[in-house]
């Protein structure tokens, strides 16, 4: 039966995808055939075939970026070291080990789901402008994050969430495969408005909040909250 595992990694980091037999196992590298593939498209990530050093079957996206340790394989550790993780690496990987002395029977099958994350930049909230006499518009921008973010606007006076119908979010996938987000908030003009923009990265359980005020010159400091304690309201509402 195939074992199933999950692992998380930051964009640009290196990660180990675990695939190992119980401790104390010994393997002959002239006997085992080891394959790492992506589970869906069956893209070849790397492999070991006895007496064959060529890796011509490896997909160009993984060439020189995915390695197994020969010393590890001898003791039954067929884990994959994946270097410089990219957003495109967020998928399921399948490790398969066959023994030729057992008639090419599978001796190990492991599926590892890789979740990829990247921190969003601290949001930048533009100074409010007035498209009309009775309306204020704020723009919040944050870039280079992963996965796709959630954006919330907060009334900083009581830390309540503003109605999401008031905001218009545009999320772009940039050249690096990371997400950029621009959120435009339109609210009724009042004498003094104290609002905040919150960018939530669900995978990292991280929220970045920046405030903006009208009616005075005091700017709210940027805040980052990780692994918050839930308050019963929507998580992003009270990260300050």
């Amino acid at each position: 039966d195939t074992q199933e595992k999950e692992v998380r990694a930051m964009v640009g980091s290196d990660v180990e995808l675990s695939c190992a037999c119980p401790e104390g196992s010994r393997f002959d590298l002239n006997d085992v055939y080891v394959y790492w593939q992506t589970s869906e498209s069956k893209t070849v990530v790397t492999y070991h075939i006895p007496q064959n050093s060529s890796l011509e079957n490896v997909d160009s996206r993984y060439r020189n970026r995915a390695l197994m340790s020969p010393a590890g394989m001898l003791r039954g550790d067929f884990s994959l070291r994946l270097f410089n993780v990219t957003p495109q690496d967020e998928q399921k990987f399948h490790c398969l080990v066959l023994s030729q002395s057992l008639g090419f029977q599978e001796v190990l099958s492991v599926e590892v789901t890789l979740h990829v994350a990247a921190n969003f930049s601290v949001p930048v909230v533009s100074a409010p402008h007035s498209p009309s006499q009775d309306e204020l518009t704020f723009t919040c921008t944050s870039i280079n994050g992963y996965p796709r973010p959630n954006v919330y606007w907060i009334n900083k006076t009581d830390n309540s969430l503003l109605d999401q119908a008031l905001q218009n979010d545009t999320v772009f996938l940039n050249m690096r495969g990371l997400y950029d987000v621009v959120s435009v908030l339109r609210i009724a003009r009042t004498p003094s408005v104290n609002i905040g923009c919150c960018i939530e990265n669900v995978l990292l359980q991280q929220n970045l909040t920046v405030g903006s005020q009208t009616g005075n010159d005091i700017g709210e400091r940027d805040k980052i909250t990780e692994n918050p304690v839930s308050t019963g309201e929507k998580n992003a509402a009270t990260w300050s």
Partner: antibody
Framework: EVQLVESGGGLVQPGGSLRLSCVGS????????MSWVRQAPGKGLEWVAY????????YYVDSVKGRFTISRDNAKNSLYLQMNSLRAEDTAVYYC??????????????WGQGILVTVSS | DIQMTQSPSSLSASVGDRVTITCRAS??????LAWYQQKPEKAPKSLIY???SLQSGVPSRFSGSGSGTDFTLTISSLQPEDFATYYC?????????FGQGTKVEIK
């Protein structure tokens, strides 16, 4: 233990259709290329059709192109061969085979026991 | 497709004889060659893979050699149960193609 069990063979009239099925067990079916190989009475082995792991690539011997369709259902560990417009020369034992994982050489073919298809009026 | 040419197409031999069958590929296939034995009404049985590796459970009187385009299957001392048809198959690339077979008969 690796097992491949074919079904769906039998006697069919020329111009008729038949659908062969093969169920694999004892291995991770979705990780391997699979194929159908046939052997006419008293003749040698002839590959008929190949299919990649995810079904995205298929290859057919010239003599069956346009008449036979290979497909697979990885959720059911099953391989299929839909045979239409059958001819007398398609009479053969049809073997389901587990092939390799890579495009270029890796592991040898593993064979099912075969099933007889007879095309005759 | 890679063409596989086997010779001879048939041979007669006696128990105890040394038998050699050759297989030639139309282009280089490194050592990605398998040999199969087939008896009437049976599926092919794997004997040799990667040109020279003996499948587990196969008697040591069977051996394979060769690389590139020319390959040989040798039965060092023919036994009564060895009378069968032998096929080579390249698995360097798809489609995996076969030789036409060599029938080993009793003299």
């Amino acid at each position: 233990e690796v097992q491949l069990v074919e079904s769906g063979g039998g006697l069919v009239q020329p111009g008729g259709s038949l659908r062969l099925s093969c169920v694999g067990s004892g291995f991770t079916f979705s990780s391997y290329w699979m194929s159908w190989v046939r052997q006419a009475p008293g003749k040698g082995l002839e590959w008929v059709a190949y299919i990649k792991q995810d079904g995205s690539e298929k290859y057919y011997v010239d003599s069956v192109k346009g008449r036979f369709t290979i497909s697979r259902d990885n959720a059911k560990n099953s391989l299929y061969l839909q045979m239409n417009s059958l001819r007398a020369e398609d009479t053969a034992v049809y073997y389901c085979a587990r092939d390799g994982i890579l495009w270029f050489g890796d592991i040898p073919t593993y064979w099912g026991q075969g099933i007889l298809v007879t095309v005759s009026s | 497709d890679i063409q596989m040419t086997q010779s001879p197409s048939s041979l007669s031999a006696s128990v105890g004889d040394r038998v050699t069958i050759t297989c030639r590929a139309s282009q280089g296939i490194s050592n990605w060659l398998a040999w199969y034995q087939q008896k009437p009404e049976k599926a092919p049985k794997s004997l040799i893979y990667t040109a020279s590796s003996l499948q587990s459970g196969v008697p040591s009187r069977f051996s394979g050699s060769g690389s590139g385009t020319d390959f040989t299957l040798t039965i060092s001392s023919l036994q009564p149960e060895d009378f069968a048809t032998y096929y080579c198959q390249q698995y360097n690339s798809y489609p995996r193609t076969f030789g036409q077979g060599t029938k080993v008969e009793i003299k």
